[in-house]
Interface confidence: low
Amino acid sequence: DAHKSEVAHRFKDLGEENFKALVLIAFAQYLQQCPFEDHVKLVNEVTEFAKTCVADESAENCDKSLHTLFGDKLCTVATLRETYGEMADCCAKQEPERNECFLQHKDDNPNLPRLVRPEVDVMCTAFHDNEETFLKKYLYEIARRHPYFYAPELLFFAKRYKAAFTECCQAADKAACLLPKLDELRDEGKASSAKQRLKCASLQKFGERAFKAWAVARLSQRFPKAEFAEVSKLVTDLTKVHTECCHGDLLECADDRADLAKYICENQDSISSKLKECCEKPLLEKSHCIAEVENDEMPADLPSLAADFVESKDVCKNYAEAKDVFLGMFLYEYARRHPDYSVVLLLRLAKTYETTLEKCCAAADPHECYAKVFDEFKPLVEEPQNLIKQNCELFEQLGEYKFQNALLVRYTKKVPQVSTPTLVEVSRNLGKVGSKCCKHPEAKRMPCAEDYLSVVLNQLCVLHEKTPVSDRVTKCCTESLVNRRPCFSALEVDETYVPKEFNAETFTFHADICTLSEKERQIKKQTALVELVKHKPKATKEQLKAVMDDFAAFVEKCCKADDKETCFAEEGKKLVAASQAALGL
């Protein structure tokens, strides 16, 4: 499958439009601070070069690898040293070290201004004036803020973004048509980015084996009628796609994803009965649809797992012959029978089974030793079930905002060293599990909740890795991918934490809070709550509730006042004094 010119091969496979879009995404994900115009210029230069290679694959430099071509192009940026500091040192390296170096400098929390949505008329004018630039800007702004966004999926988002503007800018009420669509794209985009970030962390921090195990479990739940060999083939191909995208090889990734979608649709009879609608869609929609497709029905009369994995006298023989294949078969068989379990729970069960076989297959009587292995699964299954039950009850009792506040207090007490913005962001997202998953019936709650929590806790892990401040966070994040959530759940109040000095400035507010959206105002209040807990980690729920109720009343009162700023200044002093008294500060 060797091509004389890799760049020509990808250009022809993907077409000019997708080629240009993917190169723009790749460059924006590497050089996150570069202006839009600079990236467009680089992309145009690469595209022109690619066209010369399409015309003549033997032309000068056309035989170079994509990493070499793209890296050379990135290293022509004049302000690399001033803008990116030590990242400029990457350019002194040779491939593949140079690309690895660029990857290591990707910033999950780049210091970029928040994207402010202009007025609808302004956006529609910009869209009509230059549709191509408008859509490129969307790709650029998302890619630089989400350096691990799944590139082929971002093309799908851009297609929907374009469709929204095409439809709504002609509507009678543009805003009513457009704004809900943009909100939906924003929320879906954030979720998509976070899910992909976990896949990349899984590959980069825990290796291909960890990712493959995750994929076996998930695909077996989704395609329970497919044979193990079929699932294994899909897992191998999917691993290649995600390894490429997480490694910055976006052209190869998009090309291979298209091939995988094609294969799945050509073989849907042996994969799943749920794929028919997906396979009738155009490429980008098709790939997205397959990735989100509902679980197929389980085959009737599946035999008991115990026969092959506990009762058989050949367990140790089969395990010794091909350990990963045998464990893969165990995971496949268990997962296809349990769409009601989270993927991480299935992986914990597989790990327990592996540990048991490692120990027992070396014992005098292996069968006697591993005969009760399934009994060890019971507490592992019950732990997330109980946790979800308790937290859904709490969510239903409190509602989303107050449930988030309960989690803010809980997590600030566990890891008070973590920065306040990170604690607020992560706890708010953890709190969303309630409205996302608690509405589901029992059989769907655990896969929804625990796999979502894995995604959110990974956000905490990648943000913390950048500026590590807590040994406890590092420990939970690095020891075991599948036990991250239980690790965080098990953390108690950090008794070693020295409370922050009380600083009245931290609780000084101004009239600008009154003009904030409800969401932004909640974030302000939740930020104050985290700071309160950092000052008084031993504060009771009742004490914190009293202070937060006073705070809400204070904001409401001053926002209704004629002289808001004076009210915030005078009433704020009283609030601080009252809070100090209430908390015994």
């Epitope: 500091g85 910033d107 929390n109 780049p110 210091n111 201004p113 928040r114 920065s419 306040t420 913005p421 950048k466 500026t467 000095e501 600083n503 009245a504 400035e505 931290t506 000084t508 101004h510 600008d512 930020t527």
Partner: nanobody, 124 residues
Framework: QVQLVESGGGLVQAGGSLRLSCAAS????????MGWFRQAPGKEREFVAA????????RYADSVKGRFTISGDNAKNTVSLQMNSLIPEDTAVYYC?????????????????WGQGTQVTVSS
């Protein structure tokens, strides 16, 4: 961690103007607020102005309101202080500061990073 470098100080006549600039480098993604403080000989360091880099909020000391304007550029990690209608009492070493919280604090202890300072002298 984060390095701050000020520029733009100097000697100016009363009633004149000066523009101070401060550039942040290093782990700048952690910065939320940037501000200016000043310290006259024999006096404590005092708050002048602060801005929230990721929003548009600003805050000023009463003594400079209407005369000084603070502005931040989040993309470039810079903050500027435009000082107009200067008076001799404005004479001091001016320090740029950066905070990882977003409270527009007046208290110097809320700021984690500091520049070396730049001298501003206003003669009458």
């Amino acid at each position: 961690q984060v390095q701050l470098v000020e520029s733009g100080g100097g000697l100016v006549q009363a009633g004149g103007s000066l523009r101070l600039s401060c550039a942040a480098s290093g782990r700048t993604f952690s910065i939320y607020d940037m501000g200016w403080f000043r310290q006259a000989p024999g006096k404590e360091r005092e708050f002048v102005a602060a801005t929230n880099l990721r929003g548009v909020s600003t805050r000023y000391a009463d003594s400079v309101k209407g005369r000084f304007t603070i502005s931040g550029d989040n993309a470039k990690n810079t903050v500027s202080l435009q000082m107009n209608s200067l008076i001799p009492e404005d004479t001091a070493v001016y320090y740029c500061a950066a905070a990882v919280s977003n409270w527009l604090a007046k208290d110097p202890s809320a700021y984690s990073y500091w520049g070396q300072g730049t001298q501003v002298t206003v003669s009458s």
